[in-house]
Amino acid sequence: MMTGTIETTGNISAEKGGSIILQCHLSSTTAQVTQVNWEQQDQLLAICNADLGWHISPSFKDRVAPGPGLGLTLQSLTVNDTGEYFCIYHTYPDGTYTGRIFLEVLESSVAEHGARFQIP
């Protein structure tokens, strides 16, 4: 039985041109995390495998940095980065858990400051 839950940063906003950390956390399970996949809609951004390390999709390699931890740092944000992001936790023996983050990229003067995990 899958007992775990994914905690995410939820809905976040960031400034155009800035950076943001996408973070998820798996709790309430003793399952071993073997891999975390980061996806935007139907596009893979990155994979962090516990043993093999990181894979960064070539289309994002100039704007995505691994970490911190199992998270992902998205840089040089554009308005086109607005949308849903998914962290997909592959675990043993539980299986797969998915978390959702909604990112809104705003023009500099409009963006909220102080969103959780936001990089100034």
Epitope: N37, L44, L52, G53
Partner: antibody, heavy 119, light 107 residues
């Protein structure tokens, strides 16, 4: 020039073990994962597992159920794959391959090592 | 485990032909797909990754596309040196798995 040079062909008895080596050169060994892939005669490719020399992480394909062990000697930039409890179905060409940096794609391959299991 | 099903398993074509090979994943693999070329008695060679980026030195006649579960490798104008077996592979989740291969033969 990146090179992966594997050890020579082996003939083994059923029930025994084989250890294949893969010597890497032309790049920094600790910066790239080494994978092992095998190919039975006339068959397709089968991923066996990988070794990350950066933090000694090892991952295996569970179909081998503990029969495979992947190690490395960083001082000589050499990776090893040992397969135990050999059976005739393990007769295959065994390849080591390097993963590209920050990419799960195997960009350079060894020449292959033929392992024949026969009584 | 994710199954990768390639079709056709073999095909005959002539030099200059446009060749299309398909690969279908048994479940979503996003764009985590790689294509390799293998000639008899030789190790596989990386062709295409992620799934539309050509590896260094790969001619522009090779192209890849797809996302989700359906992927395609296209050779726009087949050359004599392209007669080989082609494999797709997914790295969306472990164990990494390969398609059964497509052998491209001379007609």
């Amino acid at each position: 020039e990146v090179q992966l040079v594997q050890s020579g062909a082996e003939v083994k008895k059923p029930g025994s073990s084989v250890k294949v080596s893969c010597k890497a050169s032309g790049y920094t060994f600790t910066e790239h994962v080494i994978h092992w892939v095998r190919q039975a005669p006339g068959q397709g490719l089968e991923w066996m597992g990988g070794f990350n020399p950066n933090h000694d992480g090892t991952i295996y394909n569970q179909i081998f159920r503990g029969r495979v062990t992947i190690t490395a000697d960083k001082s000589t930039s050499t990776a090893y794959m040992e397969l135990s409890s050999l059976r005739s179905e393990d007769t295959a060409v065994y390849y080591c391959a390097r993963a590209a940096k920050l990419l799960f794609a195997m960009d350079y391959w060894g020449q292959g090592t033929t392992v024949t299991v026969s009584s | 485990d994710i199954q990768m099903t390639q079709s056709p398993s073999s095909l005959s074509a002539s030099v200059g032909d446009r060749v299309t090979i398909t690969c279908k994943a048994s479940q979503h693999v996003s764009n985590a797909v790689v294509w390799y070329q293998q000639k008899p008695g030789k190790a596989p060679k990386l062709l295409i990754y992620s799934p539309s980026y050509r590896f260094t030195g790969v001619p522009s006649r090779f192209s890849g596309s797809g996302s989700g579960t359906d992927f395609t490798l296209t050779i726009s104008s087949l050359q004599p040196e392209d007669f080989a077996t082609y494999y797709c592979q997914q790295h969306y989740s472990t164990p990494w798995t390969f398609g059964g291969g497509t052998k491209v033969e001379i007609k």
